[in-house]
């Protein structure tokens, strides 16, 4: 067990003469906050997949108002570290996504609005217990500087936090064959004997006699690589004779879910279903209210007006999870042909076709858009003898030369309010509606009726979420 720590040093204009405009103004003061998402580094997960190693949200930074005419300086930052606790071994290689969010504090009806300013991602190697490592990342016109480290929580030590330390039994030295526990020289490495035969490379133990597997390995002695070969056993592939495992210790053994969460096995790991008021990979995060905007993807937050009362997220179609953070993956059937990229929009599947293909499932082969140029990263699509440009986010018009306002078309139904957002737009729904475009009534045709206005929200307040 241990903690990943992230220290944001600065967020400001990138190098070069073209400084960006300040994200805040006298009319719209704002403040920053940051979100970090961690995943084991070598997992083949999609960008939207859960933050399997954990996630954290910073406090809000000081309120900032732009000085008229001045270029954007480094913006004031929240105090303190972002900390992401991890329960198992530190994987050594990890992937991160760090998002910089702006909270506008103008005269917003129903409270502040959020928008994403920058998002950076990377994969790094990092030994627990090592020094701080520094990263400098550019995201558009902005530059983010930060440092990070992973440290073990006592009694764990070592580069993966898998060795244990115990106080010395004798004042002078450690027992036979045991080393002092650097940097805790007054403690000794515990005589931790894993189950006989437990793989030294792929297994570890936190208690004598056990054998726990690092990600990607399975079997009683962690000697079997996880693969997708078909097996009768629910534990997945294994032994040399059958290619399948004799059921051994499973990921839910000992229930890794905290705070009364219930554990269910998934093909790769486990999943916690958390009780109201708790969330996170292991239900370890609590004290969240609807005011913190815990429901993602247009989910409707009900209850939770204060930290002692729980909240619940009602998810729109296409999303699930205690915080509507998980997309129901209908793309796994690979409906898009000719290498098209599948997008599950919740209410519909959409295929983004490679150049030269079109149709709802990219089934039509087109001629090249010879000599036709789409500006600003737009892609040319030909069909029926005419070319058109499929424009990148933020641009529109026949040749993608016009700056587009994603909210101009008033896409939010039933009085929902629209905000520009890194993925296009976000709808803040009026009470009684939910969904990515506020298209779903909360209790259609007498289905499980919810209160017209959740506790703690006045009728007319839009629902807010990150």
């Amino acid at each position: 067990a241990g903690v990943f720590e992230l220290q944001i040093h600065s967020f400001g204009p990138g190098p070069g003469p073209g400084a960006p405009r300040s994200p805040c103004s006298a009319r719209l003061p704002c403040r920053l906050f940051f979100r970090v998402c961690l995943k084991p580094g070598l997992s083949e997960e999609a960008a939207e997949s859960p933050c399997a190693l954990g996630a954290a949200l910073s406090a809000r930074g000081p309120v900032y108002t732009e000085q008229p005419g001045a270029p954007a300086p480094d913006l004031p930052l929240p105090d303190g570290l972002l900390q992401v606790p991890f329960r198992d071994a530190w994987p050594g290689t990890f992937s991160f996504i760090i998002e910089t969010w702006r909270e506008e504090l103008g005269d917003q009806i129903g409270g502040p609005a959020w928008s994403l300013l920058a998002r950076v991602a990377g994969r790094r190697r990092l030994a627990a217990g090592g020094p701080w490592a520094r990263d400098i990342q550019r995201a558009g016109a902005w530059e983010l500087r930060f440092s990070y480290r992973a440290r073990c929580e006592p009694p764990a030590v070592g580069t993966a936090c898998t060795r244990l330390c115990r106080p010395r039994s004798a004042p002078s030295r450690c027992g036979p064959g045991l080393r002092p526990c650097a940097p805790l020289e007054d403690e000794c490495e515990a005589p931790l004997v894993c189950r006989a035969g437990c793989s030294p490379e792929h297994g570890f133990c936190e208690q004598p006699g056990e054998c726990r597997c690092l990600e990607g390995w399975t079997g009683p002695l962690c000697t079997v690589p996880v693969s997708t070969s078909s097996c009768l056993s629910p534990r997945g592939p294994s032994s040399a004779t059958t290619g399948c495992l004799v059921p051994g210790p499973g990921p839910c053994d000992g229930n890794p879910c905290a705070n009364g969460g219930s554990c269910s096995e998934t093909p790769r790991s486990f999943e916690c279903t958390c009780p109201r008021g708790f969330y996170g990979l292991r239900c370890e995060v609590s004290g969240v209210t609807c005011a913190d905007g815990p429901c993602f993807n247009g989910g409707l937050c009900v209850g939770g007006a204060d930290p002692d009362s729980a909240y619940i997220c009602h998810c729109p179609p296409g999303f699930q999870g205690s915080n509507c953070e998980k997309r129901v993956d209908r793309c796994s059937l690979q409906p898009c042909r000719n290498g098209g990229l599948c997008l599950d929009l919740g209410h519909a599947l959409r295929c983004r076709c490679r150049a030269g293909f079109a149709g709802p499932r990219c089934e039509h082969d087109l001629d090249d858009c010879a000599g036709r140029a789409c500006a600003n990263g737009g892609t040319c699509v030909e069909g029926g003898g005419a070319h058109r440009c499929s424009c990148a986010l933020g641009f529109g018009g026949r040749d993608c030369r016009e700056r587009a306002d994603p909210c101009a078309a008033r896409p939010c139904a039933h009085g929902g309010r629209c905000y520009a957002h890194f993925s296009g737009l976000v709808c803040a729904c009026a009470p009684g509606y939910m969904g990515a475009r506020c298209e779903f009534p909360v209790h259609p045709d007498g289905a499980s009726a919810l209160p017209a206005a959740p506790p703690g929200l006045r009728p007319g307040d839009p629902q807010r979420y990150l």
Epitope: I97, R134, R138, A139, A392
Partner: antibody, heavy 117, light 107 residues
């Protein structure tokens, strides 16, 4: 104006070592990483590694571990790369480049290393 | 290491023509892609970073797009001074890895 001035061309014998320098000016030296890149006979580019002048931390491409050693002298705003046990495979143009962890925005003019007996 | 496959290896274009160079990564690199231009006997120059952000001072005829594993750079109206070799580079993971390069010549 940001500038990276690299040392001149080098002719070395197989088995020798060489140290290439990269003097930075026009910006605060410890604010950015220094990356080193190899280009063999005008073909593609290979990243050797980088050094963070502030902390002194280094990252190496596994292929160049044991071959290249990166150091800095903060007082003179200079980055160095030492290459040891030279062979003809090490003959190339070597560049230093200022940058962060996801970009390299200013490059030195390159140092040509020829290894020949 | 992440492999970068760049195509085509070479091409010739007329002045005013639109040119597209593509780069495929062996795994998702989450927009951490840069494009460099290298003229004969010179150092590489950063054109585009984060897949689609244009570096200061780079003409607007250059643009970048893509996501996941597929990325491309477009030169909207080829100019004689664009004759050079172009490289893509992923910076999502260490080591940085470059594509094999595309040699662009004027027709």
């Amino acid at each position: 104006e940001v500038q990276l001035q690299q040392s001149g061309p080098e002719l070395e014998k197989p088995g020798a070592s060489v140290r290439i320098s990269c003097k930075a000016s026009g910006y605060s030296f410890t604010d950015y990483n220094m990356h080193w890149v190899k280009q063999s006979n005008g073909k593609s580019l290979e990243w050797i590694g980088n050094i963070d002048p502030y902390y002194g931390g280094t990252n190496y491409n596994q292929k160049f571990e044991g071959k290249a050693t990166l150091t800095v002298d903060k007082s003179s705003s200079t980055a160095y790369m030492q290459l040891k046990s030279l062979t003809s495979e090490d003959s190339a143009v070597y560049y230093c480049a200022r940058g962060g962890n996801n970009y390299g925005d200013y490059w030195g003019q390159g140092t040509t290393l020829t290894v020949s007996s | 290491d992440i492999q970068m496959t760049q195509s085509p290896a070479s091409l010739a274009a007329s002045v005013g023509e639109t040119v597209t160079i593509t780069c495929r990564a062996s795994e998702n690199i989450y927009y951490s892609l840069a494009w460099y231009q290298q003229k004969q006997g010179k150092s590489p120059q950063l054109l585009i970073f984060n897949a689609n952000s244009l570096e200061d001072g780079v003409p607007s005829r250059f643009s970048g797009s893509g996501s996941g594993t597929q990325y491309s750079m477009k030169i909207n109206s080829m100019q004689p001074e664009d004759t050079a070799t172009y490289f893509c580079k992923q910076a999502y993971d260490v080591p940085w890895t470059f594509g094999g390069g595309t040699k662009l010549e004027i027709k």
